[in-house]
Amino acid sequence: MMTGTIETTGNISAEKGGSIILQCHLSSTTAQVTQVNWEQQDQLLAICNADLGWHISPSFKDRVAPGPGLGLTLQSLTVNDTGEYFCIYHTYPDGTYTGRIFLEVLESSVAEHGARFQIP
């Protein structure tokens, strides 16, 4: 029996080279959010602590921006960014809630058309 609910942006797609906002929202609980961790599969991307603020993992500093809110913005997307992302909410007194987002990074439409159509 869980009290809260995590709402996420679900399955999303974005173009290579572009940006995307990963967003989760915890609802249906009065629990206090003490920290939110963002992970990409098995890597920690960022932490937002209620007292200490944001910390971005050094290996992602150039391409990850905090916010908006408790969300995360990924920039300069590559096809290697395709995969699962998790928002992990640590709350008191409820415990931990986890949301999942699947991101697919597509080749840009310009690149696709360039590959498909050749000018004679």
């Epitope: 029996m1 961790n37 640590h90 409820d94 949301g99």
Partner: nanobody, 127 residues
Framework: EVQLVESGGGLVQPGGSLRLSCAAS????????RGWFRQAPGKGLEWVST???????????TYADSVRGRFTISRDNSKNTLYLQMNSLRAEDTAVYYC?????????????????WGQGTLVTVSS
Amino acid sequence: EVQLVESGGGLVQPGGSLRLSCAASGYTYSRKCRGWFRQAPGKGLEWVSTLYTSSGGTYFDTYADSVRGRFTISRDNSKNTLYLQMNSLRAEDTAVYYCAARLSTDFCGPRADFDYWGQGTLVTVSS
């Protein structure tokens, strides 16, 4: 099939310490929700602590008010073992302690439904 086996219980004097262990087999997920519960003689099951861990490095522990500051939940990934370090033990901590694991990690806390349980280990605090 997931199997959980607790150990480390015993008789200890008030103010003493014990460390409980819970060895898991078949529980090899990248995200884990595990916890400790206890049942005192003649009483219902009581949540003690939960631990959410992920291979990405997230480590979130939560405690019941009655044990916060005295008990610490931890884990050893290499041994796939969960621990409960119990310090400053009191007579009211006397109970059978159970380790539990949850398959889904969408929620990990005192109100979560746990899928797998160990057989329990008895902790008696008495002088």
